[in-house]
Interface confidence: medium
């Protein structure tokens, strides 16, 4: 006899769940490893997924489903710090699975739905970690969580264009097929399908902005929440021409003859998944920190154009955003190879490391523009002092890849909002699940931002202090493990996280984070919306709320205006000034010649054989 | 009672650094915010910044960054804060100010106990 | 930054007068402003929080009043210690800034 409470019927068959406890006595129910999509397996490697064929039997998703091929990170075994981010599931090409987690209400129904996309670079990431578990969420809310695994590294985003058989994106693709699947089920389990808010972390929340942006993903949800992540930026997507050359060179480090695309395709889905995962650091045209193998591509379908020129043009979904960052976004990739960093030391970084550091950090610069980064981030009174050197570091990291991306769109989405209140053309309906519109062809826009800086670190961080609020540890507030007695939280940090949760929920439910569930609002002092000429923005920790202006605004002028403006400028200057070095050598040795033949000259007798 | 009190009177020259405390007495230091403002005559008063005693999170008036560093000592209950690279700009009152405590329920940062002020001149 | 705009700069009254200060924002602040006095030689104190809400010990007759960008301190039947210089503070958005004082006089 199976409990009719744990067995629920959707469009593709029977699913068994189980019920999981959560800590004031109570429990929710989760389906863990619900298939969603036909395993990409074979010649399914490399392409679009395939949603789902019914099945007859009732499924069991009482576990959570295998991880996909990845990366694992071995620099530090069994430091919980690296290794909480490591699949904790078998890997395996079979992973197109999600995970629901309903509150144990007597009869749910038309509940919120919040979906969770995880971060790791397009390279890693998995829904099974111990920090993505939605059950506190789900509880404390009352909203239905649901996450799913996409396809990461060369299986999720290789690219050949013109090719069918591996047109690029395809990770993107497995999460809107996810996104589609709460659609059309997610009510059977007493979720509002026309009430879905996405919601992500670094390359999650670059994911979560991509969907914005890209018009057949617009309809599948509502809302977004995007956490030190945007879709805009240095390392979140390529060019066509520049995917073709990594897929070619991981071809031919995994010893695929040169070819054309069709052997190479077959090639590579000859090869066994860790040789692809080996090598897929060695197809990197350069090292630098925040760099990935194999990102997003600008397709011109998934994307019909680069997000910073989709931002641009307003042509993104019209509706209401959370997004924000942590204070140290960059100290984590900083122990990751750049020169003078460890987690094992206080990271005291010489002036020489400094320099070294930039290099690494801002790959694409050359050295003008490496020099304006440098002239910005020293403290000229000051620039041998090793902490200083250290902060500044972190700060490059995080400004660049993190920080001022996330606030150009920020400032962007904002901007649209304001331009739509003016022109006052007929509105698409833009609450509505269904507005695949653009911020820029509607009236009366639904735009409103809502922008946080956390800056809490956790009393039981395991990494060292000089690395600060880290990226990624903001997770762990916002899926409620503070609540877990056993996880050795402060009480302060138990409120901040159930406060952090009920801010993320009724942003889900009401597009308004200071808005609960009743209509009510808890304190007098409120969040923000945050706006292109002001920037006000909440600081998220274990004190009262307190609203500022201004995202590192100098640095990110910086890095938004100034520095693509410089490189732009100087893009040939080195090319020229070689180019313009040989000429001169050339002249040089001209004229000297031509000097030697004019003192000859002026030494003869004149006239002399008139 | 509440009391801060702060250090003596300092002359300094141009160029120079100098640190100056604010004892605190009366209340629980690490659960109250500690301010520091500057008062001269030019300006009124001026907030440099504020700090958390119990996290040791700052927050500064970007226009004081690069001339103040708040610290403090849990175990004395004192705040400090330096200015460096003083010049005649910098003669002033500076005051220790505390705000708010450290709760996720009150909402309001305006100083409710001030320290006597601590005079300094900067002068060659 | 917010600009915080008082007035007058100065003001002279008698003794069991009616008196009003004024402070200006620049924007709105939802009324996160404070009003403190500060007599000659001594450290400013607390009078008013939030815009209307005396601070403990604060006689009645001093009282908080406005909202948006527009606050005023009022103080009814004025005592020859209320001689004094009076600030208004705002904590809606850091940095928190001060309005420039009013000097008030006894005639």
């Known amino acids: 006899q199976t409990d009719p409470e744990l067995t629920i019927m959707t469009r593709l068959g029977q699913v068994q769940g189980t019920r999981l406890p959560v800590p004031d006595r109570s429990h929710v129910i989760a389906f863990l490893g619900i298939p969603f999509a036909e395993p990409p397996l074979g010649k399914m490697r490399f392409k679009p997924p395939e949603p789902k064929k019914p099945w007859n039997d009732v499924f069991d998703a009482r576990d959570y489903p295998s991880a996909c091929y990845q990366y694992v990170d071995t620099s530090y075994p069994g430091f919980s710090g690296t290794e909480m981010w490591n699949p904790n599931r078998m890997m395996s090409e079979d992973c197109l699975y999600l995970n629901v987690w309903v509150p144990a209400t007597p009869r749910p129904h038309n509940l919120t739905v919040m979906v969770w996309i995880y971060g790791g670079g397009f390279y890693s990431g998995s829904s099974s970690l111990d920090v993505y578990d939605g059950r506190y969420l789900a509880h404390s809310e009352k909203v239905v969580v649901v996450s799913m695994n996409y396809r990461v590294s060369a299986f999720g985003f290789l690219a050949l264009n013109g090719s069918a058989e591996a047109p690029g994106n395809v990770g993107l693709l497995d999460q809107r097929l996810a996104l589609q699947w709460v659609q059309d089920n997610i009510h059977f389990f007493g979720g509002n399908p026309k009430q879905v808010t996405i919601f992500g972390e670094s390359a999650g929340a670059a994911s979560v902005g991509m969907h914005l942006l890209s018009p057949d993903s617009r309809p599948k949800f509502t809302r977004a929440i995007l956490q030190s992540g945007v879709p805009n930026g240095p390392w979140r997507t390529v060019s066509f021409d520049e995917a073709r050359r990594r897929a070619i060179k991981l071809g031919r480090l995994v010893g695929c003859p040169d070819g054309n695309d069709t052997d190479l395709i077959d090639c590579l889905r000859s090869k066994q998944p860790q040789d692809l995962i080996d090598q897929e650091w060695l197809v990197l045209p350069f090292s630098g920190l925040f760099r990935f193998s194999f990102v997003p591509v600008i397709d011109g379908v998934v994307f019909p154009d680069t997000p910073e020129a989709m931002l641009n043009s307003g042509n993104f979904k019209d509706t209401q955003i959370l997004l924000g960052v942590n204070q140290n976004e960059g100290s984590y990739f900083l122990i990751y190879g750049a020169p003078g960093f460890s987690k094992d030391n206080e990271s005291l970084i010489t002036r020489e490391d400094f320099l070294q550091g930039v290099k690494m950090s801002v790959p694409h610069a050359n050295e003008i523009g490496l020099e304006a980064v440098i002239l910005q981030y020293t403290d000229w009174m000051d620039e041998d002092n090793p902490i200083k050197n250290r902060e500044a570091m972190d700060d490059i990291v995080g400004d660049h890849n993190v920080v001022c991306p996330l606030q150009h769109f920020a400032k962007m989405y904002a901007q649209y909002s304001i331009l739509q209140g003016q022109t006052g053309t007929a509105s698409q309906g833009n609450l509505g699940w269904g507005n695949s519109g653009s911020a820029s062809n509607s009236g009366n826009s639904q735009v409103s931002v809502y922008l946080y800086m956390f800056d809490h670190r956790a009393s039981n961080l395991v990494w060292p202090e000089w690395m600060g609020v880290i990226h990624g540890y903001e997770i762990e507030f916002v899926f409620g493990l503070p609540l877990e007695k056993r996880l050795n939280y402060t009480l302060e940090e138990e409120k901040l996280s159930r406060r952090m949760m009920k801010y993320w929920a009724n942003f889900a439910r009401t597009g308004n984070p200071n808005i609960n569930v009743d209509g009510s609002i808890d304190s007098r002092r409120r969040w923000p919306v945050f706006t292109s000429t002001e920037q006000k923005h909440v600081g998220l920790n274990t004190d009262s709320l307190k609203v500022h202006k201004g995202l590192k605004s100098q640095f990110c002028a910086l890095w938004n205006r100034f520095l693509p403006r410089l490189l732009n400028v100087t893009e040939n200057i080195d090319d020229a000034e070689r180019q313009w070095k040989a000429e001169f050598h050339r002249w040089s040795s001209y004229m000297m010649h031509w000097k030697n033949q004019f003192d000859h000259y002026s030494k003869q007798e004149r006239c002399t054989n008139l | 009672e509440v009391q801060l009190q702060q250090s003596g009177p300092e002359l300094v020259k141009p160029g120079a650094s100098v640190k100056i405390s604010c004892k605190a007495s009366?209340?629980?230091?690490?659960?109250?915010?500690m301010n520091w403002v500057k008062q001269s005559p030019e300006k009124s008063l001026e907030w440099i910044g504020e700090m958390s005693p119990s996290t040791g999170r700052t927050t500064y008036n970007q226009n004081f960054k690069a001339k103040a560093t708040l610290t403090v000592d849990q175990s004395s209950s004192t705040a400090y804060m330096q200015l460096k690279s003083l010049t005649s700009e910098d003669s002033a009152v500076y005051y220790c100010?505390?705000?708010?405590?450290?709760?996720?329920?009150?909402?309001?940062?305006?100083?409710?106990?001030w320290g006597t002020g601590t005079t300094v001149t900067v002068s060659s | 930054d917010i600009q915080m705009t008082q007035s007058p700069a100065s003001l002279s009254a008698s003794v069991g007068a009616t008196v009003t200060i004024t402070c200006r924002t620049s924007?709105?602040?939802?009324?996160?402003l404070a009003w403190y006095q500060q007599r000659q030689g001594k450290s400013p104190q607390l009078l008013v929080y939030a815009a209307t809400n005396l601070a403990d010990g604060v006689p009645s007759r001093f009282s908080g009043s406005g909202s948006g960008t527009q606050y005023s301190l009022k103080i009814n039947s004025l005592q020859s210690e209320d001689v004094a210089r009076y600030y208004c503070?705002?904590?809606?958005?850091?940095?928190?800034?001060f309005g420039g004082g009013t000097q008030l006089e006894i005639k």
């Open positions: 503070q705002h904590y809606s958005t850091t940095p928190w800034t």
């Open positions: 924007e709105n602040i939802d009324s996160y």
């Open positions: 009366g209340y629980s230091f690490t659960g109250y915010y």
């Open positions: 100010a505390r705000s708010v405590p450290l709760t996720t329920l009150i909402e309001d940062w305006y100083f409710d106990v």
